[in-house]
């Protein structure tokens, strides 16, 4: 059984553990620039002209919902976007047109590493504070595919990148989130 996506009537969607995010709609107002203007991916194939590759890490910020609850703060996730390979028919920095060789290796822009983030949820009706952990993409890369690769092989996760283990601490008061209740009530 896989982890279900974090969704609210199919509107805001954040991937659950073990799932990949779909790139958000292009006109979404919460998406901002590509990191470093579309920083070059880890690319073993023709790495000389990195400006030709467009595997980008896009930051996408939104509130998460779970049932009637909403995250206390917006969460920023990273979405892997773009083609891995020279952009077809697009001029490069010095005006030449580059073509993607049809028989060349196939690269896919996919998540490379993940992090888990604990999200505090605010719920209506004086509910006890609740939390959820979501798995978010930490970085993207171009991964080379061969005819033998299938979808499941695309989904092999990168190195563990969740926050480092902290020392155990006494937990905060269980009702600590109640102070935020008024804010939530205004949201419904």
């Amino acid at each position: 059984q896989g982890w279900q996506a974090f969704r609210n009537d199919a509107t805001e969607v954040i991937p659950g553990l073990g799932e990949y995010p779909e790139p958000p709609p292009e006109n979404n107002q919460t998406m901002n620039r590509a990191e470093n203007g579309g920083r070059p991916p880890h690319h073993p194939y023709d790495a000389k002209d990195v400006s030709e590759y467009s595997c980008r890490e896009l930051h996408y910020t939104r509130f998460l919902t779970d049932g009637p609850c909403r995250s206390a703060k917006p969460v920023t996730e990273l979405v892997c976007s773009g083609q891995c390979g020279p952009a077809r028919l697009l001029p490069n920095a010095i005006g030449r047109v580059k073509w993607w060789r049809p028989n060349g290796p196939d690269f896919r822009c996919i998540p490379d590493r993940y992090r888990a983030q604990r999200v505090q949820l605010l719920c209506p009706g004086g509910a006890a504070p609740r939390s959820r952990k979501v798995r978010l993409v930490a970085s993207c890369k171009c991964k080379r595919l061969t005819r033998f690769h299938n979808q499941s092989e695309l989904k092999d996760f990168g190195p563990e990148t969740a926050r480092p283990q902290k020392g155990r601490k006494p937990r905060p008061g269980a009702r600590g989130a109640k102070a935020n209740q008024a804010e939530l009530e205004n949201a419904y």
Epitope: L17, G67, K133
Partner: antibody
Amino acid sequence: QVQLVQSGAEVKKPGASVKVSCKVSGFPIKHHFQHWVRQAPGKGLEWMGWSDPEIGDTEYASKFQGRVTMTEDTSTDTAYMELSSLRSEDTAVYYCATGDTTYKFDFWGQGTTVTVSS
Amino acid sequence: DIQMTQSPSSLSASVGDRVTITCKASQDVHTAVAWYQQKPGKAPKLLIYWASTRWTGVPSRFSGSGSGTDFTLTISSLQPEDFATYYCQQYHDYPWTFGGGTKVEIK
């Protein structure tokens, strides 16, 4: 494939402590919350508490406060539940469960029978 | 603590029957209710959460409804593998509490 494998059955005397382990595989334990639920013979389910292995945060049911301790070893992806000052009413099957929230139990271990008897 | 009262405590039904189990909370829990299925000698399995959302892999014959204090688990057409005990659970306020269970037996 998510799997939770618990330690074997235990027989304890009243006043003693028991420590049950739960080995998680299929994901890093710190990406989830760990829950413990018990079930007395022929009875219903009783939630004991949850812990967040990543930061050591815990929430215990008031009934078990002061008697229960939930810990984890993230290097081995193993959760532990220790219950002290045992009495006969603590005889039950103890289940570990895991999930991405503090409130629902997505995957469960097979259970560990703890018998408290003099 | 919030009490969750399930009814009936047991019922007999045949394969193909429509089965309805109810759960009543001692106070308003909004939609913070989950349902679990447990077979003898086995661990429970999550079926429904947020009162009506089916967990991954749960057959569509299982459905949940309700809000506030009254909740229902419905099995639209009982299958041989559905004979088990069903528990509701509230997670509106600590401590999370379960109903006493409803045992669904073969008629």
